[in-house]
């Protein structure tokens, strides 16, 4: 058993049929010695008396808010949550495995640049009685500060018969050094509480590995005189790190016909303009990636050819 | 460069960009054995890193690029020695067409661009790695190449910025 926050305790349980559970001793936070009784949640049933209460915690029915009383007045509360361990593995019932980039990916994080700001998100099918809290640091043995904002419900989607909820959080490294080579990874820890179930999820990454630029902006097409060719140009996204002579991007461009099956020629360039053949009903697209480190490509930015 | 003169920024830019490409094509290494993703994501701790105080940011390069270039040079020599060690030359053998050979040569090439004849002090200072056991090598290769990718990315940014803003 350990204290999650004031008056909230997590009991770690090996979860298997007929498991013995954990013996827990609760102490009433009061100078009083006599006439103390204990109840669980809203039930008025007295579980025991005295300044301490010893219970055997085996299942969710044994968890909840224990209150000590004297003469009808509540003296203190202790909320017991359960953290299940099955076959040596902590439960992951609350969040959905996103399976990208690999199995057992519950938290996904992205950064638009090297400023030390990043966003993490996770998915669940649970809609009520659910709370999250997030902590983050750079490194674990001698952690450096990362400040995270409030968790927000960022999207709701219908997947078949189920509704899926996406939660996200934004974090910022306190003293980021965009030009340096990261030596220690960022650690993100998410605590999830659903009713009386406690779970925790972690992710560890370097900002350089989660970079995903915003799409290039200001796509423009300029037809060339007496030619089927078009001069296309674009700009670095506003959110990308500066100066661009240092934080350079590379681009992938393609012309896509009306039919998705049509062969697309992709061209890679470090420049912010190119000459392409842009047929009527086709569209021109461009995406960006860090020029020197193969992190994610941005989403495509597109304009119609006509 | 060691005496405080300017490097051939454009040449360094080209070679460092080539290094980035090679470092990514060399990893994941397709050797004679599969490598499951093992070990922590934290790279090997004893490799040199370009840190905040090394003056490799745009402002630091403008003020005095020598600190940064010296740091890059040390890192290049360190990785060049690692890629020549039995971690990469021993069993399980790299495939004959592995890009590691080219990567190794390019590290040497860039470090020589930054260190003309007659300046060999860093080379002596950096010890060669002690012999490794074959069973350690796949994971060591994986970690070294991951770490090298990050190192050469910063070096390439430095040379691109230098070529654009500091070239005479």
């Amino acid at each position: 058993i350990w204290e999650l926050k004031k008056d909230v305790y997590v009991v770690e349980l090996d979860w298997y049929p007929d498991a013995p559970g954990e013996m827990v001793v609760l102490t009433c936070d009061t100078p009083e010695e006599d006439g103390i009784t204990w109840t669980l949640d809203q039930s008025g049933e007295v579980l025991g008396s005295g300044k301490t209460l010893t219970i055997q915690v085996k299942e969710f029915g044994d968890a909840g808010q224990y209150t000590c009383h004297k003469g009808g007045e509540a003296l203190s509360h202790s909320l017991l949550l359960l953290h299940k361990k099955e076959d040596g593995i902590w439960s992951t019932d609350v969040l959905k495995d996103q399976k990208e980039p690999k199995n057992k990916t519950f938290l996904r994080c992205e950064a638009k640049n090297y400023s030390g700001r990043f966003t993490c998100w996770w998915l669940t099918t649970i809609s009520t009685d659910l709370t999250f809290s997030v902590k983050s640091s750079r490194g674990s043995s001698n952690p450096q500060g990362v400040t995270c904002g409030a968790v927000t419900l960022s999207a709701e989607r219908v997947r078949g018969d189920n509704k899926e909820y996406e939660y996200s959080v934004e974090c910022q490294e306190d003293s980021a050094c965009p030009a340096a080579e990261e030596r220690l990874p960022i650690e993100v820890m998410v605590d999830a509480i659903h009713k009386l179930k406690y779970e925790n999820y972690t992710s560890s990454f370097f900002i350089r590995d989660i970079i995903k630029p915003d799409p290039p902006k200001n796509l423009q097409l300029k037809p060339l005189k007496n030619s089927r060719q078009v001069e296309v140009s674009w700009e670095y996204p506003d959110t990308w790190s500066t100066p661009h002579s240092y934080f350079s991007l590379t681009f992938c461009i393609q012309v896509q016909g009306k039919s998705k099956r049509e062969k697309k020629d992709r061209i890679f360039t470090d420049k912010t303009s190119a000459t392409v053949i842009c047929r009527k009903n086709a569209s021109f697209s461009v995406q960006a990636q860090d020029r020197y480190y193969s992190s994610s490509w941005s989403e495509w930015a597109s304009v119609p050819c006509s | 460069v060691p005496g405080g003169s300017s490097p051939a920024w454009a040449q360094c830019q080209q070679l460092s960009q080539k290094l980035c490409t090679l470092a990514w094509s060399a990893h994941p290494l397709v050797g004679h054995m599969d490598l499951r993703e093992e070990g922590d994501e934290e790279t090997t701790n004893d490799v040199p890193h370009i840190q905040c105080g090394d003056g490799c940011d745009p402002q630091g390069l403008r003020d005095n690029s020598q600190f940064c270039l010296q740091r890059i040079r040390q890192g290049l020599i360190f990785y060049e020695k690692l890629l020549g060690s039995d971690i990469f030359t021993g069993e399980p053998s790299l495939l004959p067409d592995s890009p590691v050979g080219q990567l190794h040569a390019s590290l040497l090439g860039l470090s020589q661009l930054l260190q003309p004849e007659g300046h060999h002090w860093e080379t002596q200072q950096i010890p060669s790695p002690s012999p490794s056991q074959p069973w350690q090598r796949l994971l060591l290769r994986f970690k070294i190449l991951r770490s090298l990718q990050a190192f050469v990315a910063v070096a390439a940014r430095v040379f691109a910025h230098g070529a654009a803003t500091l070239s005479p």
């Epitope: - | 020549g84 039995d86 030359t89 021993g90 069993e91 790299l94 074959p134 069973w135």
Partner: antibody, heavy 115, light 107 residues
């Protein structure tokens, strides 16, 4: 073609030393390690040690430590194995071999130790 | 040190027979194992590396299997040129050690 060519047979007196050479050709000498293995008459194979010609790093079998020295000359792509304080039990065929999983071995050098 | 125990030390077989040689490591070596064929007065010839990979130019009747501590070399149909001594060798850690050898003779 890719090959390892070893020096010729040697007859040595007990207490003396022998130095066997192994010349590599057809590949980049510094991209692989070079092992030395011996085989006594009618016996099995025994690893003695290896050298990384790139940095001259060596790794020896404890059994031979202090008696064996493996060196390499990058300029001639040649590896050497020197065994000192020879005794009759050192009579064997000595082989050089590139990385085990590449299948490249020298033809062997017979060393006879006899008074 | 990791010991390699090869069995049998010798066997007699006829052309066309299926022959199996086993090799046991005293500790876990994953798949860091080679198999060699040696004929009198010649250097060992690599047949299998990485426990299961067939060396280029080696006939497909030779195959290797196993991982961890137990390994097998199989010759699916023995040919006249296969009569020789076979050695396994581990390259997981130093000192690299060889099995004692298996002499395959004509019945």
């Amino acid at each position: 073609q890719v090959q390892l060519v070893q020096s010729g047979a040697e007859v040595k007196k007990p207490g003396s030393s022998v130095k066997v050479s192994c010349k590599a050709s057809g590949y980049k000498f510094t991209r692989y390690v070079m092992h030395w293995v011996r085989q006594a008459p009618g016996q099995g194979l025994e690893w003695m040690g290896y050298i990384n010609p790139y940095n001259d790093g060596t790794n020896y079998n404890e059994k031979f430590k202090g008696r064996v020295t493996i060196t390499a000359d990058k300029s001639t792509s040649t590896a050497y194995m020197e065994l000192s304080s020879l005794r009759s039990e050192d009579t064997a065929v000595y082989y050089c071999a590139r990385n085990w999983d590449t299948g490249l071995w020298g033809q062997g050098t017979t060393v006879t130790v006899s008074s | 040190d990791i010991q390699m125990t090869q069995s049998p030390s010798s066997l007699s077989a006829s052309v066309g027979d299926r022959v199996t040689i086993t090799c046991k490591a005293s500790d876990h070596i994953l798949k860091f194992l080679t198999w060699y064929q040696q004929k009198p007065g010649k250097a060992p010839k690599l047949l299998i590396y990485g426990a299961t990979s067939l060396e280029t130019g080696v006939p497909s009747r030779f195959s290797g299997s196993g991982s961890g501590t137990d390994f097998t070399l199989t010759i699916s149909s023995l040919q006249p040129e296969d009569f020789a001594t076979y050695y396994c060798q581990m390259y997981w850690s130093t000192p690299f050690t060889f099995g004692g050898g298996t002499k395959v003779e004509i019945k």
